[in-house]
């Protein structure tokens, strides 16, 4: 059984442009949750969703980050406009 | 109804410390964002602090990074700043603010910092 | 840090009047936030996300702009409404307020 899939796996942009994160968690899994890790702010919980639904936004309170579920099966994680300090692995993780 | 009780103010000598306290009810606490705002004597309002629900992303206006400290405790729904090497120009009007509706939704009162000789 | 520039920064009015609030950043955001302050009391969320209004705020009250310059308008001022108004960007930490705009009887 696939994991949770990510795309892209690697993102370069210039500051202000748009980037676009993607996720589809695993079949079945009702949770579906974004995350950033830096070095400097080590791991922070951007947002989670629980049926599509979202649950709590509080990691992501700058205004250039939305996240969107669709469907049981995808979401969106987006950045208008990106800045330099966005740079980070960004994970997308799901649970039962 | 959303209520948010701060404390912990008074007046304090320069180089001081202080912890102010923002008691949160009528909602669920451990889901929201938080902020703490000032406001000094006849000034406009100024932006202090943000931590999220459990405490993984935190803020700070850039003049006040290294002396103040956000924190949060969600069993006891209550929300705190920790204020050090306090200045004169610390003194000001502190509320803390629920993240809703993007901004924020519900205030407090306010708790009232002096810092004086 | 973005800036925001509030216009007037005083204004007297008499009740009745339509006003027009102007909130310039610095740099572009989003969106702009509105809040209302009366003396001694704590602020109080008037419009979100540009030009939604906050449950209970009347709809003399819009909020309209894009880029770098957002507008607050009260169609027909009541006495009530005399209070200093702050916009706030939320579009990149940190979330700075403008100066305020004072609405003073005329």
């Known amino acids: 059984d696939a994991g949770v899939i990510q795309s892209p796996r690697h993102e370069v942009t210039e500051m202000g442009q748009e980037v676009t994160l993607r996720c589809k968690p695993i079949s079945g899994h009702n949770s579906l949750f974004w995350y950033r890790q830096t070095m400097m702010r080590g791991l922070e919980l951007l947002i989670y969703f629980n049926n599509n639904v979202p649950i709590d936004d509080s990691g992501m309170p700058e205004d250039r980050f939305s996240a969107k579920m669709p469907n049981a099966s995808f979401s969106t994680l987006k950045i208008q406009p990106s800045e330099p300090r966005d740079s980070a692995v960004y994970f997308c993780a799901s649970s039962l | 109804e959303v209520q948010l009780v701060e404390s912990g103010g008074g007046l304090v000598q320069p180089g001081g410390s202080l912890r102010l306290s923002c008691a949160a009810s009528?909602?669920?606490?451990?889901?929201?964002?938080m902020h703490w705002v000032r406001q000094a004597p006849g000034k406009g309002l100024e932006w202090v602090s943000y931590?999220?629900?459990?405490?993984?992303?935190?803020y700070y206006a850039d003049t006040l990074k290294g002396r103040f400290t956000i924190s949060r405790d969600n069993s006891k729904n209550t929300l705190y700043l920790q204020m050090n090497s306090l200045r004169a120009e610390d003194t000001a009007v502190y509320y803390c603010?629920?993240?809703?509706?993007?901004?924020?939704?519900?205030w407090g009162q306010g708790t009232t910092v002096t810092v004086s000789s | 840090d973005n800036q925001l520039t509030q216009s007037p920064s005083f204004l007297s009015a008499s009740v009745g009047d339509r006003v027009t609030i102007t909130c310039r950043a610095s740099s572009s955001v989003n969106y702009i936030y509105w809040y209302q302050q009366k003396p001694g009391k704590a602020p109080k969320l008037l419009i979100y996300y540009t030009s939604n209004l906050a449950p209970g705020v009347p709809s003399r009250f819009s909020g309209s702009g894009s880029g770098n310059e957002y507008t607050l308008t009260i169609s027909s001022l009541q006495p009530e409404d005399f209070a200093t108004y702050y916009c706030q960007q939320f579009t990149s930490s940190p979330f700075t307020f403008g100066q305020g705009t004072k609405l003073e009887i005329k």
């Open positions: 931590i999220s629900s459990g405490s993984s992303t935190i």
């Open positions: 603010a629920r993240r809703g509706e993007g901004a924020m939704d519900y």
């Open positions: 009528g909602f669920t606490f451990s889901n929201q964002g």
